[in-house]
């Protein structure tokens, strides 16, 4: 018989309360861990990294710290006002080598549009990435870096989820070993040549991403070559065997009827905790319905919702959700009509998703207004159309030769939103800022060996 | 097929006036702008006017304001530039073009276009 692989990269997952208070409720919270978890999953299982196969990735744990833990002098993000740098510190700080990765998700829109920072894995001989256990390091402080942090909020918005998606999985990138893309053959955004310009950028290009271009959720072939050697190295030393769901971390997987954590972190009257016996644990309790963490449409006293209760809100491109009385999941919305306007104006509704640009809506594709002399810097903030497939019609949708269109109103793109051909992101004044891939991580790593440069934070 | 077709143009004193007529098929003219841009030998194609066909608004350039006019008449598929008060400046060929989404001056955003008409005005 065959030894079956160690594929699977177990995740610990953290939440601090700024991201409990802008999703709501635990149940919120855990839905986006787990679209977050499957969206790599699905990246990383279908990427060969050079033999290597079918990587995939399990929340062996999960925290999530409330609102209520704001106060707590225990839970170490609590500080409101934090870098990025010492945000991944925090994190660090902790011991965490039960698990392959440790991340911890947030709301906090921090300098220069960085969206996230980890610690790069490599062959060997140095600190950082996937299965690196906690040891001492100079600044006289025990750390993990097998670490990272990903914010869902940049420049004062929020980042569409397939963004944040792509964020996670460019930070686990780092972990895995891969720097950033460079080079012609890795960086095809960056292209003179249309037809490669066109497919976009990959994974780990080092600025902005829109998430809707065909290499935006792709590996190139230079991060595969480095993930690939980290992978041969270092994979033994803490991956493990795919197959059986863990109890425990909150997700409802197969095999388990429900999960509501264990006993410290289960509020659930309807669910045995993972504390319990082998028999018993993540299954209902008698007589039970359903368990609230199985889906919105449970209620806490282990019933299905009624027909007609509300279990989604209304969004730009889709109907609000309705529970149907027999599910505790949230059925899926109905899709407003392609092509309705919404991201305030700057974008249209495609197959119930807000996806394709406002341009799109007049047979135009959306572009960068960018001059080559750098003279019209003020106008790489407004949303650009151009014909298809000809960047010599590229114009601002306040431009004449858009008012067909756009009357003469200039649309802005929203803050937050790629410019500069993904060269930065726009902020609140509507400039663009160039992005600063490479800086965080390097402070971070000069703190480390000397701790002087580091303040401490005050609470 | 897109056909545009110019006409009108000729020879003319300073001073006079001359209407050209830009005659148009193949395409749904309510759905396009049309614009008149001329060219005069060494120099770029510049735009003149243009007008859009669902709403009729128009642009024009500030060198021809207030002395050129364009109009379309849509049951007869055709586009009208009125020139008053010419100037020796105004010696051009002038050509006519149509796009589905564009407006403006900028002839890199019009797709078809006319042969031309020579325009020349004498001092």
């Known amino acids: 018989t065959t030894s079956a692989e160690k594929n699977t990269c177990q995740l610990y997952i953290q939440t601090d309360h700024l991201f409990f208070k802008y999703y709501g409720t635990r149940e919120a919270v855990i839905a986006q861990i787990s679209s977050h978890v499957k969206a790599i999953d699905t990246i990383y299982q279908t990427t060969d990294f050079s033999g290597i196969r079918n990587i995939s990735f399990m929340v062996k744990r999960i925290r999530i710290n409330t609102t209520a833990d704001e106060k707590d002098p225990t839970n170490p993000f609590r500080f409101p006002n934090i870098g990025v740098e010492k945000f991944l510190e925090l994190n660090s700080e902790q011991n965490h080598d039960d698990y392959c990765l440790a991340y911890v998700f947030t709301d906090r829109d921090f300098d220069d549009g960085v969206l996230g920072l980890a610690w790069v894995g490599a062959p060997s001989g140095s600190s950082g990435g996937i299965c690196e256990k906690s040891k001492l390091y100079s600044d006289g402080k025990k750390k993990s870096l097998n670490t990272g942090i990903i914010t869902v909020q940049n420049y004062g918005s929020h980042v569409p989820p397939k963004v944040s998606h792509i964020t996670f999985a460019h930070e686990v990138g780092h972990n895995f070993g891969s720097p950033h893309d460079s080079g012609t053959e890795c960086t095809p955004g960056e292209s003179k040549n249309l037809g490669q310009k066109e497919n976009g950028n990959y994974i780990m290009y080092a600025r902005a991403t829109s998430g809707d271009k065909l290499n935006n959720n792709k590996f190139s072939l230079c991060s595969i070559r480095n993930i690939s050697q980290v992978l041969e190295k270092k994979r033994n030393n803490c991956f493990v065997e795919s197959g059986q769901p863990i109890c425990g971390n909150g997700m409802v997987e197969q095999g388990e009827e429900c999960d509501c954590g264990y006993s410290d972190q289960c509020k659930d009257e309807c669910c045995f905790d993972a504390n319990q016996p082998e028999g018993r644990k993540c299954k209902l309790k008698p007589g039970k319905q359903c368990s609230p963490s199985q889906g919105p449409c449970c209620t806490a006293q282990c019933a299905f919702k009624s027909k007609s209760e509300k279990c989604r809100d209304d969004s730009d491109c889709a109907r609000e959700g309705i529970c149907n009385g027999f599910t505790a999941l949230c059925p899926a919305s109905d899709p407003k009509p392609n092509f309705t306007d919404c991201n305030r104006h700057t974008q249209v509704c495609i197959n119930g998703q807000c996806a394709g640009s406002i341009c799109e809506k007049y047979g135009l594709e959306e572009c960068t207004c960018a001059s080559s002399d750098g003279k019209d810097d003020k106008e790489l903030c407004h949303v650009c159309c151009m014909k298809k497939m000809d960047p010599s019609t590229c114009a601002s949708t306040g431009s004449v030769q858009w008012s067909r269109h756009f009357s003469g109103r200039t649309i802005t793109l929203q803050p937050g939103s790629p410019c500069n051909d993904f060269r930065g992101y726009c902020d609140v004044f509507m400039r663009c800022r160039l992005v600063d891939a490479d800086g965080p991580l390097a402070r971070l790593k000069k703190a480390i060996f000397s701790p002087e440069l580091y303040e401490n934070i005050a609470e | 097929e897109v056909q545009l077709v110019e006409s009108g143009g000729g020879l003319v004193q300073a001073g006079g006036s001359l209407r050209l007529s830009c005659a148009a098929s193949g395409f749904t003219f309510d759905d396009y702008a049309i614009g008149w841009f001329r060219q005069a030998p060494g120099k770029e194609r510049e735009g003149v006017s243009c007008?859009?066909?669902?709403?009729?608004?128009?642009y024009y350039a500030d060198s021809v304001k207030g002395r050129f006019t364009i109009s379309s008449d849509n049951a007869k598929n055709t586009v009208y530039l009125q020139m008053n008060s010419l100037k020796p400046e105004d010696t051009a060929v002038y050509y006519c073009a149509a796009d589905r989404l564009a407006f403006g001056l900028d002839s890199n955003f019009y797709d078809y276009w006319g042969q031309g008409t020579q325009v020349t005005v004498s001092s």
């Open positions: 007008i859009s066909m669902s709403d009729g608004s128009t």
